[in-house]
C-alpha cells in the first residue's frame, strides 16, 4: 500500500493488476482492480499500452470516452460498466491478436486519489487436448489432438504405471499449420500402450499448459483434461 500525495494533493490509491494471457481470435480480459469510490462521476479509467500512441480505452464520467482511442483497438474494448463503481477496471478485449501482447498500464483517478499498475499481457493460442484410442492402428495406440496452439508447444507423454518413463522413443508428434497460418494443430501418437493404465498427454508452451488423461481398462475408457495458464502474477 502506497500512501502519498500526488501533484493534485490527493492520496495515492491502490491499483492491482494480474499478468494474463490472451487466446488469439477469442476474447480476453486484462484484469485491474482499484480502491472503489462511492460515486461514479469522479472515476476515470485509462488503459494504455507501451509503444502505442493513442489510448487503449478510457472511461470517465460514467461512460466510455473513445475519442483518443488508438486505431488498433477500435471497436474491440469494453469495461464492465456495472462493476466500475465497486472497483473493477478490468478490460474486455475482443478478438485478441498476436500483436496485442505487451505491457499495459491501468491508470485510475477517483475522488480519493490516483494510482496505476502495469500488466504483462501475453498472446498465443492454447486449447484442450483430447486423447482417444486409435483403433485404426495395428497395435494399441493412443492419439492426442489439440486444435490450436501457438507458439509451437512441447508434447510429453506420461503414464501412471511407468512413472518417470521416457516415451519419446515410442511416440510421434506433428504440428499442422491451421488455415489462418498462425496457429497449429497438435497431433501426438503413443504406441505400445498397455491396458489398465492411465496415460497423460501434456502440451506446454510459455503461455499455457494443458493435460489430457485417458484411463484404459478392459471394460471402459475414462477421459479427463484440463488447461492452466502460466505466469499469472499480481502486481
Amino acid at each position: 500500500l502506497i500512501i502519498g500525495f500526488g501533484i493534485s494533493g490527493r492520496h495515492s490509491i491502490t491499483v492491482t493488476t494480474v499478468a494474463s494471457a490472451g487466446n488469439i481470435g477469442e476474447d480476453g480480459i486484462l484484469s485491474c482492480t482499484f480502491e472503489p469510490d462511492i460515486k461514479l462521476s469522479d472515476i476515470v479509467i485509462q488503459w494504455l499500452k507501451e509503444g502505442v500512441l493513442g489510448l487503449v480505452h478510457e472511461f470517465k464520467e460514467g461512460k466510455d470516452e473513445l475519442s483518443e482511442q488508438d486505431e488498433m483497438f477500435r471497436g474491440r474494448t469494453a469495461v464492465f460498466a456495472d462493476q466500475v463503481i465497486v472497483g473493477n477496471a478490468s478490460l474486455r478485449l475482443k478478438n485478441v491478436q498476436l500483436t496485442d501482447a505487451g505491457t499495459y498500464k491501468c491508470y485510475i483517478i477517483t475522488s480519493k486519489g490516483k494510482g496505476n499498475a502495469n500488466l504483462e499481457y501475453k498472446t498465443g493460442a492454447f486449447s484442450m487436448p483430447e486423447v482417444n484410442v486409435d483403433y485404426n492402428a495395428s497395435s494399441e495406440t493412443l492419439r492426442c489432438e489439440a486444435p490450436r496452439w501457438f507458439p509451437q508447444p512441447t508434447v510429453v507423454w506420461a503414464s501412471q504405471v511407468d512413472q518417470g518413463a521416457n516415451f519419446s522413443e515410442v511416440s510421434n508428434t506433428s504440428f499442422e499449420l491451421n488455415s489462418e497460418n498462425v496457429t497449429m494443430k497438435v497431433v501426438s501418437v503413443l504406441y505400445n500402450v498397455t491396458i489398465n493404465n492411465t496415460y497423460s498427454c501434456m502440451i506446454e508452451n510459455d503461455i499455457a499448459k494443458a493435460t489430457g488423461d485417458i484411463k484404459v481398462t478392459e471394460s471402459e475408457i475414462k477421459r479427463r483434461s484440463h488447461l492452466q495458464l502460466l505466469n499469472s502474477k499480481a502486481s
Epitope: 472503489p36 469510490d37 460515486k39 461514479l40 462521476s41 464520467e61 472497483g87 480519493k112
Partner: antibody, heavy 115, light 107 residues
Framework: QVQLQQPGSVLVRPGTSVKLSCKAS????????MNWVKQRPGQGLEWIGG????????EYNEKFKGKATLTVDTSSSTAFMDLNRLTSEDSAVYYC????????WGQGTLVTVSA | DIMLTQSHKFMSTSVGDRVSITCKAS??????VAWYQQKPGQSPKLLIS???YRYTGVPDRFTGSGSGTDFTFTISSVQAEDLAVYYC?????????FGAGTKLELK
C-alpha cells in the same frame, strides 16, 4: 454468503446519543464501502453517508453532518454510526448497506426517540 | 443535489401484466442508476445496477433501461410476489439520492 447483522430496535431519550452497529461477514470487510440509510415510518430512503473501512475515509450527506458520525472496527468487521442530540425527527429505521451499489442490506435497526 | 422523480406514487396492476416504472433525474447521471424492491417489513433489495444490469439471482422478468436523465424499470409479467415499493437511486454524485418510490399494488 454476505450478512449484515443489526440490532432489531433501540429506545432512546430525546437529547441523548445512540451508537448503532452493523456486523459484516461473508466478504472482505475492508474493501467495500459501507453505507447508512434512514427510513422514517411509511417514508422513502435517505442516504446518510458511507465509510471505506480500509482507510476510514468517510462521505456524508450534508444534511446529516453534525448529526451522524461513521466509524469502523476492522478487527471485528463492524461498522458503527453515532447519532447525537436525538429528537423525534430521528425516529426511524436505520439500515447499513454494502458497497456503492447497496448490494446487500442489514435488516435495519428501529430507533425510537421518546421521553 | 441530484433529484430523482418517480412520477407515480402508486401503480395498479394485475398478475401477468407488463408494468413499467419511470425515474427522471434532475441532471445527467450517465447510467449510474440502481433499482431496489422493498416489501413491507423488509429491507430493500438490489434488482438492477448501472441502469440495465440485473443483479445476481434476480429473475429475468425484471429489466432496466435508460441513460442520461430518463430511466425505466420493467416487470415483463407481474407475479403476486412482486407487489412491493420500487425505488430508483443514483450513485453518480454525492449525496447519493433515491426516488420517492412507486408502490405496485393489485387492481
Amino acid at each position: 454468503q454476505v450478512q449484515l447483522q443489526q440490532p432489531g430496535s433501540v429506545l432512546v431519550r430525546p437529547g441523548t446519543s445512540v451508537k448503532l452497529s452493523c456486523k459484516a461477514s461473508g466478504y472482505t470487510f475492508t474493501s467495500s464501502w459501507m453505507n447508512w440509510v434512514k427510513q422514517r415510518p411509511g417514508q422513502g430512503l435517505e442516504w446518510i453517508g458511507g465509510i471505506y473501512p480500509n482507510r476510514g475515509t468517510t462521505e456524508y450527506n450534508e444534511k446529516f453532518k453534525g448529526k451522524a458520525t461513521l466509524t469502523v472496527d476492522t478487527s471485528s468487521s463492524t461498522a458503527f454510526m453515532d447519532l447525537n442530540r436525538l429528537t423525534s425527527e430521528d425516529s426511524a429505521v436505520y439500515y447499513c448497506a454494502r458497497d456503492s451499489r447497496f448490494a446487500d442490506w442489514g435488516q435495519g435497526t428501529l430507533v425510537t426517540v421518546s421521553a | 443535489d441530484i433529484m430523482l422523480t418517480q412520477s407515480h406514487k402508486f401503480m395498479s396492476t394485475s398478475v401477468g401484466d407488463r408494468v413499467s416504472i419511470t425515474c427522471k433525474a434532475s441532471q445527467d447521471v450517465s447510467a449510474a442508476v440502481a433499482w431496489y424492491q422493498q416489501k413491507p417489513g423488509q429491507s430493500p433489495k438490489l434488482l438492477i445496477s448501472s441502469a440495465s444490469y440485473r443483479y445476481t439471482g434476480v429473475p429475468d422478468r425484471f429489466t432496466g433501461s435508460g441513460s442520461g436523465t430518463d430511466f425505466t424499470f420493467t416487470i415483463s409479467s407481474v407475479q403476486a410476489e412482486d407487489l412491493a415499493v420500487y425505488y430508483c437511486q443514483q450513485h453518480y454524485n454525492t449525496p447519493l439520492t433515491f426516488g420517492a418510490g412507486t408502490k405496485l399494488e393489485l387492481k
